[in-house]
């Protein structure tokens, strides 16, 4: 007799979730020698321990601490790239600019990127049918709490000049309710972070507006300045050109460096 299972509004755990996490962990430690000390079986056990047998609307950051401890990793100063609502371009950028890192270039972010997971209270099963939706069910679900936890840690450990890529095509270029706006901005440490530099990515080809003057960017500047961190903003008018110039900086059309305005 199939046992009763809570029906949530969100999609269920990604198929082959344990295998995917383990495979990613192995691949990551193979490719990043500095993480060779990581035992992927222990990482999976800690990951599993954070949500298995727990009510999936009552997950806490504390549940993820054993995993966070195992995945401890530092980014060199000036090399942290945050992003909001523009993940693909941020990842394309760090794939080319190999010495800069988004959260998904770090072990824990890499493990969980694009995956969904949840368990059930008092059973050892993974729920492949449905998981809580952040809006319709609850915010303290395994996936949301994971990203809040690791995003907080990522921001806390950043130092030097921190960069953030923002989507200029959205109505709120800076959204206080995004992970960047609600978690990362507030966890940058003023004693370690000298400045936040925002890169506003333009969507339209003929869009020559200065989006650094957008009210939401001004709001971001205000929040950052109040935290005693300097703020800079750049328009990236042609993201395709921008990536091309990162790949080939010697290209004659890249030498002028006139693709963006720069604001203090």
């Amino acid at each position: 007799v199939p046992r009763w299972r809570q029906q949530w509004s969100g999609s269920g755990t990604t198929s082959r979730f344990p295998e995917t996490v383990l495979a990613r962990c192995v691949k990551y430690t193979e490719v990043h020698p500095e993480m060779r000390h990581v035992d992927c079986q222990s990482v999976w056990d800690a990951f599993k321990g954070a949500f298995i047998s727990k009510y999936p609307c009552n997950i806490t950051e504390e549940d993820y601490q054993p995993l966070v401890k195992l995945g401890t990793q530092t980014v060199p100063c000036n090399k942290t790239l945050l992003w909001s609502r523009i993940k693909d371009l941020a990842h394309q950028f760090t794939q080319v600019q190999r010495d800069m890192f988004t959260l998904e270039d770090m072990l824990l972010g890499y493990l969980a990127d694009d995956l969904t997971w949840c368990g059930e209270f008092n059973t050892f099963e993974i729920n492949y049918q449905s998981c809580p939706d952040w809006r319709k069910d609850c915010s303290n679900n395994p996936v949301s709490v994971f990203w809040k936890t690791v995003s907080r840690r990522f921001a806390e450990t950043a130092c030097g000049v921190v960069h953030v890529m923002l989507n200029g095509s959205r109505s709120k270029i800076f959204d206080k309710n995004s992970t960047f706006g609600s978690v990362e901005v507030h966890n940058l440490q003023p004693e370690k972070v000298q400045a936040l530099e925002a890169w506003v990515i333009h969507g339209g080809r003929e869009d020559s507006r200065d989006l650094c003057q957008d009210p939401t960017i001004k709001e971001l500047e205000s929040i950052i300045s109040k935290r005693n961190i300097r703020f800079f903003c750049k328009n990236i008018y042609r993201p395709d050109k921008f990536l091309q110039c990162v790949k080939n900086p010697e290209d004659s059309s890249c030498l002028s460096g006139i693709h963006h305005h720069h604001h203090h």
Partner: antibody
Framework: QVQLVQSGAEVKKPGSSVKVSCKAS????????INWVRQAPGQGLEWMGR????????NYAQKFQGRVTITADESTSTAYMELSSLRSEDTAVYYC??????????????WGQGTLVTVSS | EIVMTQSPATLSVSPGERATLSCRAS??????LAWYQQKPGQAPRLLIY???TRATGIPARFSGSGSGTEFTLTISSLQSEDFAVYYC?????????FGQGTKVEIK
């Protein structure tokens, strides 16, 4: 005791493909990375790639990307290495190899006996 | 990819003598280095991993040292069964790469 037993010698024509098998016994197969290493006559060793059967996860050396496919059949504890578009330079002894530790494939404690593949017209 | 260079290509040693084999990496591989022994018609056999840790069942006369780019395999007193080809292998960066080998022959 772990044993890796490979399929027999093969003679192949240029342009064709070869599929070498490696059957593991004496240990739990699925969690261990099976690697393939080749050695041309009188030459050194060359790592080609690896698979972790349980994770269905294969990785290849850039040199062989697109020409080599490593697969595994968990039910028979057998790994396979298929090399396509064969040329005379692919004449070599092909070894499967495994590490002691589950999941990892850094260095190799256990080796198959080797399979000689000769490519000749 | 990381290029591993072994020297000498051939080493002639009398039984009972000490043999010192060298392996150099084109860039740092930390301590992620292994040594293998291979006899004619046989598969390689793991001797050392982690640059200096002896594999299970390997006699104490085999020792490894070094880190970064310079590594050494020392056989303190050569026995007749030690005459073979020795390979180093780095497992720091994809793809894993081997040296071209050092043949230890009877003098």
């Amino acid at each position: 005791q772990v044993q890796l037993v490979q399929s027999g010698a093969e003679v192949k024509k240029p342009g064709s493909s070869v599929k070498v098998s490696c059957k593991a016994s004496g240990d739990y197969f699925n969690n261990y990375a099976i690697n393939w290493v080749r050695q041309a006559p009188g030459q050194g060793l060359e790592w080609m790639g690896r698979i972790i059967p349980f994770l269905d996860d294969a990785n290849y050396a850039q040199k062989f990307q697109g020409r080599v496919t490593i697969t595994a059949d968990e039910s028979t504890s057998t790994a396979y290495m298929e090399l396509s578009s064969l040329r005379s330079e692919d004449t070599a002894v092909y070894y499967c190899a495994r590490a002691t530790s589950p999941l990892y494939s850094y260095y190799f404690d256990y080796w198959g006996q080797g399979t000689l593949v000769t490519v000749s017209s | 990819e990381i290029v591993m260079t072994q020297s000498p290509a051939t080493l002639s040693v009398s039984p009972g003598e000490r043999a010192t084999l060298s392996c150099r990496a084109s860039q740092s591989v930390s301590s992620n280095l292994a040594w293998y022994q291979q006899k004619p018609g046989q598969a390689p056999r793991l001797l050392i991993y982690g640059a200096s840790t002896r594999a299970t069942g390997i006699p104490a006369r085999f020792s490894g040292s070094g880190s970064g780019t310079e590594f050494t395999l020392t056989i303190s007193s050569l026995q007749s069964e030690d005459f073979a080809v020795y390979y180093c292998q780095q497992y720091n960066n994809w793809p894993w790469t081997f040296g071209q080998g050092t043949k230890v022959e009877i003098k």
